[in-house]
């Protein structure tokens, strides 16, 4: 008996071939011997089966001795043994119809779980293997689960159902709703304007929800809400904003925040959360602000950084075009009695400069002692 695998919702063509290459009488029946379709001369006739409106054949092939049964919009319950009667012969074809669906919506939040459920006919024992867009393979039976979805899981999942050494392939498009970056660091000199951007890693027709930026300043004992906003059809409207700092927010996507000036008291870490309509859970993006200040007080030239710096970073003070006078894994370095010239304060990661601030040291003229 020939086995054919079909996909729920698809169309399948079951073949039946006569030895004579001409149009002769044929009938397709199901396992209960109920006629599905056949011919009367050059006319297609249909029987009382449940497939009535979904069954068809190709008249153009009859003259070549081919009498296919075409079943459209396949259902799991179409799984059956189909019998083609032609030239006093019976050809049996076993059709097994499978369906693979995502548990809920195919738009899932980062960190959520994806469950794929296989619908299969009674008596079948299929195995399923799915390959994610990033090439990760998962195997299972009737259900497959992937916990903690990541941004790289967005895209087409290819799932292969194996039964009786035959296979059928399903493609499911999954959209992981997330920010493009989980975390970002902005390095700024004191007084500079700060731009925070929160681009989304997906596009949808209508995007509605609400969001908030909580900020934990390095110098503060607790975090506070800097801004809350609404999102309606990709339009942003501010609900509430603190007076210090007075953030500004762009009216269109991507979400964009402007801090008028970087100050040591603002250095720290923020967490932007976005709750989307009809979705449980929230999207998160961490943002960090590092602020640098170079100052000269009497005979002391100091360079300081505030904010979440990595212990791998090096802070240096150097006279322009000269070797670093001081270079340490610290958040503050200083030079006593600096010579005149343009000094550079540098925050670097393995030689890569992340932040630079220049300060001019003027020559100190010694006043002559009066006799």
């Amino acid at each position: 008996k020939k086995v054919v695998l079909g996909k729920k919702g698809d169309t399948v063509e079951l073949t039946c071939t006569a030895s004579q290459k001409k149009s002769i009488q044929f009938h397709w029946k199901n396992s209960n011997q109920i006629k599905i379709l056949g011919n009367q001369g050059s006319f297609l006739t249909k029987g009382p089966s449940k497939l009535n409106d979904r069954a068809d054949s190709r008249r153009s092939l009859w003259d070549q001795g081919n009498f296919p049964l075409i079943i459209k919009n396949l259902k799991i319950e179409d799984s059956d043994t189909y019998i083609c009667e032609v030239e006093d012969q019976k050809e049996e074809v076993q059709l097994l119809v499978f369906g693979l669906t995502a548990n809920s919506d195919t738009h899932l939040l980062q960190g959520q779980s994806l469950t794929l459920t296989l619908e299969s006919p009674p008596g079948s024992s299929p195995s399923v293997q799915c390959r994610s867009p990033r090439g990760k393979n998962i195997q299972g039976g009737k259900t497959l689960s992937v916990s903690q979805l990541e941004l790289q899981d967005s895209g087409t999942w290819t799932c292969t159902v194996l039964q009786n050494q035959k296979k059928v392939e399903f493609k499911i498009d999954i959209v992981v709703l997330a920010f493009q970056k989980a975390s970002s660091i902005v390095y700024k000199k004191e007084g500079e304007q700060v731009e925070f951007s929160f681009p989304l890693a997906f596009t949808v027709e209508k995007l509605t929800g609400s969001g908030e930026l909580w900020w934990q300043a390095e110098r503060a004992s607790s975090s506070k809400s800097w801004i809350t906003f609404d999102l309606k059809n990709k339009e942003v409207s501010v609900k509430r904003v603190t007076q210090d700092p007075k953030l500004q927010m762009g009216k269109k996507l991507p979400l964009h925040l402007t801090l008028p000036q970087a100050l040591p008291q603002y250095a720290g870490s923020g967490n932007l959360t976005l709750a989307l309509e009809a979705k449980t859970g929230k999207l998160h993006q961490e943002v960090n602000l590092v602020v640098m200040r170079a100052t000269q007080l009497q005979k002391n030239l100091t360079c300081e950084v505030w904010g979440p710096t990595s212990p791998k970073l090096m802070l240096s003070l150097k006279l322009e075009n000269k070797e670093a006078k001081v270079s340490k894994r610290e958040k503050a370095v200083w030079v006593l009695n600096p010579e005149a010239g343009m000094w550079q304060c540098l925050l670097s990661d393995s030689g890569q400069v992340l932040l630079e601030s220049n300060i001019k040291v003027l020559p100190t003229w010694s006043t002559p002692v009066q006799p």
Epitope: P311, S350, Q352
Partner: antibody, heavy 119, light 113 residues
């Protein structure tokens, strides 16, 4: 598993230059800085400088300033160390070494390249 | 530049006994900002590149046997091999990475008595 594979041994005359290569395989090339460390026969270890493959920025030890040049080719995941005006005391094994992910100690080393300076 | 000085220059210890190597830096390698000691220990066997054993003065690199331990803070550091094995015969180096140029100690040769 990340590996650093260095070019073969070199014999050079005093005053000449040598260029040693260090090819990274099995990891993200631009994520970690590469240092060069040398070791004269029977002697200790001496740090020469560092290159950040992502931007190509360098930081050389003052002792080698003006004589050493570190470069990188991101297309081949290779860093190079060129030492000019060679003298006999530059005879040493030259190592490239990668800094750790969370620290700047050297967690992965190349096999070393022997450079002999002799007239 | 920070000068790293190791003692002793060489050490002969019986198998199974404790070996202790000291390392002194000419200035502190403890960062007050990050509360970390920027000190590493390496093992080098003949004809091989050095191998990282310890970083942050006391954090063991993955895959390094737990008989190796590091301690100390500021300017004084110690590498201890609690029970010397035949495969531990090597030269051991301390290194500071608090400031550039990164500098190494002169090395301590460990042998079996």
């Amino acid at each position: 598993q990340v590996q650093l594979v260095q070019s073969g041994a070199e014999v050079k005359k005093p005053g000449a230059s040598v260029k040693v290569s260090c090819k990274a395989s099995g990891g993200t090339f631009s994520s970690y800085a590469i240092s060069w460390v040398r070791q004269a026969p029977g002697q200790g270890l001496e740090w020469m400088g560092i290159i950040n493959p992502s931007g190509g920025s360098t930081n050389y030890a003052q002792k080698f300033q003006g004589r050493v040049t570190m470069t990188r080719d991101t297309s081949t995941s290779t860093v190079y160390m060129e030492l000019s005006s060679l003298r006999s005391e530059d005879t040493a094994v030259y190592y490239c070494a990668r800094e750790g992910r969370d620290h700047d100690a050297f967690d992965i080393w190349g096999q070393g390249t022997m450079v002999t300076v002799s007239s | 530049d920070i000068v790293m000085t190791q003692s002793p220059d060489s050490l002969a210890v019986s198998l199974g006994e404790r070996a202790t190597i000291n390392c002194k830096s000419s200035q502190s390698v403890l960062s007050s900002s990050y509360n970390k000691n920027y000190l590493a220990w390496y093992q080098q066997k003949p004809g091989q590149p050095p191998k990282l054993l310890i970083y942050w003065a006391s954090t063991r690199e993955s895959g390094v046997p737990d008989r190796f331990s590091g301690s100390g803070s500021g300017t004084d550091f110690t590498l201890t091999i609690s029970s010397l094995q035949a495969e531990d015969v090597a030269v051991y180096y301390c290194q500071q990475y608090y400031t550039t140029p990164f500098t190494f100690g002169q090395g301590t040769k460990v042998e079996i008595k």
